[in-house]
């Protein structure tokens, strides 16, 4: 039943042209190589993605021409070596051009950047970007891809085209319009924000195939569909999990031609086979590919089957739960998997994976006890806590940011994040409390059987970048610690982290608090990250400061931008109320 | 009223196959494990298998390979396949309702009435 | 395979008589105590009488009683009534749900 059987290919890069079609193949290969090597400028990946493109033409022509037959990882990895300032741009990663397939590869996936030193992405004026588009638009989306391509090592490429076509809808229909702006820039801003959210969603699963193998990444996948499809079989729901599996591992190993025809495959195969996987998937399946793909991976739950039996039944009260168990045991544990999910959309995918955990830690023990229904009659008790300290987590945390609201809740989640894991550079800690705090606006709304979910998966997402940033420059043992040992409970593990008493302050440094009347000109966001980051610095000089004392500076500080803002001569202003809030807030916080 | 219905006996050819259904009534196949028992004319009862509420399933060892019991829970029924039948096979089939829900205690407190199957060239 | 064996394999009584009948498993029973007895009258289906060799079925009267652990099982039918006279059937439940077995029956007739 798998759908990925395929006969062998002569020439697979001549396969994935005609699978593909020229569009995609050439938006595929530039997303590839922009992945890869994101310093080079956009010129020269255009030229090498024009040269790949004429190259497999040619394979497609005729499939035995010279070199048709090679791999697609040594056709592109051969082209990459071809660049000329390889080891000026790179430093070492040209080394992974002396290593042969598939370590080439390997080596090149290992230098990918999730943090590359790229200027921010500055947004041209509405005319300027629609001239742009008129004037040679293929060219302009091309750019697009690219863009984001270099910035988003991960991201998911089949879901890049889709972004892509959206991209260029916005700009058809609002470069047309009467006011440009309205139109556009709405549009604008809803693509950053849902591909920022698509990007850290993909760099999760492309973590936990990488860091913790394709059996994580499966389980993950089984509770997620089993909560999405709760009326699909769990053979169903195996195939898909497997084929979702090769799709991802494809993506997340720079093998974005082979993903997207797969996903394309997968998609196709889902909407043949929607009356025995969910009956939401109607209007997902009249749509066009890339749309219909995006809409199944979004869709909403299905209902739950009425009159599902009791799972102590089959998994605790059976005297067979050993014998199951010992014959197959990722199956059986798959299974117990699958029917806690689809009774429980109501959990967060993580809290279901600690409960499977927790349940063959527990057979594990008992399958070699003396009497081991005895052992494990009470598995299910053992539950109980790990749903409730999520549940009140939650509850909270929500609490807490009806109160404060969302500037507010980020900014107790800076301190909060701060004081735990001090050593963290302050733009990743502004950064990940920052998207932390945004937990509340998306979650809190919820009612209570949506708002595990949203918020457990959605922190698991924010702190995978914490992870992954923080692997790069390694600075606390806490932080590695709690990224490494366990995917599923990264969340607990954070969130049971104390003040780090062994912190020695940061010295302080009168610079870091001065500010200037640019800010003035700062849109609010970008106002509020300058405050942030003042606040961490704060912590860092003062990490036993109390709420209350944090709490005055920063309102000192706001009414000291508002004050200067308003001033006639704004930089002055800075210059001399800057010292007096220095000192004042030297002797508030007693440093 | 609470009863199960067997139903697709009949006369079949040796090597042939046949699935045998068990419709429930008046309550919902979904709390108890299913079971399927066998009796030959004028002979004893042999257990064949029986399939859990979550779908496990397990067999005699006679039976392994050849019968399959499976359900369906939208429908309240239970099925048996039968392949590569033998004369011995002849036998009237009976489905069953297990007091326990994931497993086989071999206490039955529901019984169909029963589905003569002959095996026969 | 596990093996059940009943005896006596058929007996004769009387209205009023107490009559015992029993079974033996190969194997210890699963918790020592699975084992039931069924009642069967031509042309009709099994009844169950006794689980978890002492538990009394729904609707079954108290002149049924069933005892024994582990591998020796009685079923006692304290004073015989006419509609008593059929075959019963012991069966047990194992460490596996694979090999649950009935014995091959004790065949009660009027003396």
């Known amino acids: 039943r798998g759908v990925f059987r395929r006969d062998a290919h002569k020439s697979e890069v001549a396969h994935r042209f005609k699978d593909l079609g020229e569009e995609n193949f050439k938006a595929l290969v530039l997303i590839a190589f922009a992945q890869y090597l994101q310093q080079c400028p956009f010129e020269d990946h255009v030229k090498l993605v024009n040269e790949v493109t004429e190259f497999a033409k040619t394979c497609v022509a005729d499939e035995s021409a010279e070199n048709c037959d090679k791999s697609l990882h040594t056709l592109f990895g051969d082209k990459l070596c071809t660049v000329a300032t390889l080891r000026e741009t790179y430093g070492e990663m040209a080394d992974c051009c002396a290593k042969q397939e598939p370590e080439r590869n390997e080596c090149f996936l290992q230098h990918k950047d999730d943090n590359p030193n790229l200027p921010r992405l500055v947004r041209p004026e509405v005319d300027v970007m629609c001239t742009a588009f008129h004037d040679n638009e293929e060219t302009f989306l091309k750019k697009y891809l690219y863009e984001i391509a270099r910035r988003h090592p991960y991201f998911y490429a089949p879901e890049l085209l889709f972004f892509a076509k959206r991209y260029k809808a916005a700009f058809t229909e609002c470069c047309q319009a009467a006011d440009k702006a309205a139109c556009l820039l709405p549009k604008l801003d809803e693509l950053r924000d849902e591909g920022k959210a698509s990007s850290a969603k993909q760099r999760l699963k492309c973590a936990s195939l990488q860091k913790f193998g394709e059996r994580a990444f499966k389980a993950w996948a089984v509770a997620r569909l089993s909560q999405r499809f709760p009326k699909a079989e769990f053979a169903e729901v195996s195939k898909l999990v497997t084929d979702l599996t090769k799709v991802h591992t494809e993506c997340c190993h720079g093998d974005l031609l082979e993903c997207a025809d797969d996903r394309a495959d997968l998609a196709k195969y889902i909407c043949e086979n929607q009356d025995s996987i969910s009956s939401k998937l109607k209007e997902c399946c009249e749509k066009p590919l890339l749309e219909k793909s995006h809409c199944i991976a979004e869709v909403e739950n299905d209902e739950m089957p009425a009159d599902l039996p009791s799972l102590a039944a089959d998994f605790v009260e059976s005297k067979d739960v050993c014998k199951n168990y010992a014959e197959a045991k990722d199956v059986f544990l798959g299974m117990f998997l699958y029917e806690y999910a689809r009774r429980h959309p109501d959990y967060s995918v993580v809290l279901l994976l600690r409960l499977a955990k927790t349940y063959e830690t527990t057979l594990e023990k008992c399958c070699a006890a003396a009497d081991p229904h005895e052992c494990y009659a009470k598995v299910f008790d053992e539950f109980k806590p790990l749903v409730e300290e999520p549940q009140n987590l939650i509850k909270q945390n929500c609490e807490l940011f009806e109160q404060l609201g969302e500037y507010k809740f980020q900014n107790a989640l800076l301190v909060r994040y701060t004081k735990k894991v001090p050593q963290v550079s302050t733009p990743t800690l502004v950064e990940v409390s920052r998207n932390l705090g945004k937990v509340g606006s998306k979650c809190c709304k919820h009612p209570e059987a949506k708002r595990m979910p949203c918020a457990e998966d959605y922190l698991s997402v924010v702190l995978n970048q914490l992870c992954v940033l923080h692997e790069k420059t390694p600075v606390s043992d806490r932080v590695t610690k709690c990224c490494t040992e366990s995917l599923v409970n990264r969340r607990p593990c954070f969130s049971a982290l104390e003040v780090d008493e062994t912190y020695v302050p940061k010295e302080f440094n009168a610079e870091t608090f001065t500010f200037h009347a640019d800010i003035c000109t700062l849109s609010e966001k970008e106002r509020q990250i300058k405050k942030q980051t003042a606040l961490v610095e704060l912590v860092k000089h003062k990490p036993k400061a109390t709420k209350e004392q944090l709490k005055a500076v920063m309102d000192d500080f706001a009414a000291f931008v508002e004050k200067c803002c308003k001033a006639d001569d704004k930089e002055t202003c800075f210059a001399e109320e800057g010292k007096k809030l220095v000192a004042a807030s030297q002797a508030a916080l007693g440093l | 009223e609470v009863q199960l219905v067997e139903s697709g006996g009949g006369l079949v050819q040796p090597g042939g196959s046949l699935r045998l259904s068990c419709a429930a009534s008046?309550?919902?196949?979904?709390?108890?494990?299913m079971g399927w028992v066998r009796q030959a004319p004028g002979k004893c009862l042999e257990y064949i298998g029986i399939i859990s509420v979550g779908g496990f399933t397990y067999y005699a060892s006679w039976a392994k390979g050849r019968f399959t019991i499976s359900r369906d829970n939208s429908k309240n029924t239970v099925y048996l396949q039968m392949n590569s039948l033998r004369a011995e096979d002849t036998a009237t089939y009976f489905c069953a309702r297990d007091r326990h829900g994931g497993d086989s205690s071999g206490a039955f407190y529901l019984w169909g009435q029963g589905t003569l199957v002959t095996v026969s060239s | 395979d596990i093996q059940m064996t009943q005896s006596p394999s058929s007996l004769s009584a009387s209205v009023g008589d107490r009559v015992t009948i029993t079974c033996q498993s190969s194997e210890s029973v699963y918790s020592n105590n699975q084992l039931s007895w069924y009642q069967q009258k031509p042309g009709q289906p099994p009844k169950l009488l006794i689980y978890?060799?002492?538990d009394l079925a729904s609707g079954v009267p108290s002149r049924f009683s069933g005892s024994g652990s582990g591998t020796d099982f009685t079923l006692t039918i304290s004073s015989l009534q006419p509609e008593d006279f059929a075959t019963y059937y012991c069966?047990?439940?194992?460490?596996?749900?694979?090999?649950?077995?009935f014995g091959c029956g004790t065949k009660l007739t009027v003396l």
């Open positions: 008046g309550f919902s196949l979904s709390s108890n494990a």
């Open positions: 978890d060799a002492s």
């Open positions: 069966a047990g439940g194992f460490s596996s749900s694979s090999d649950t077995a």
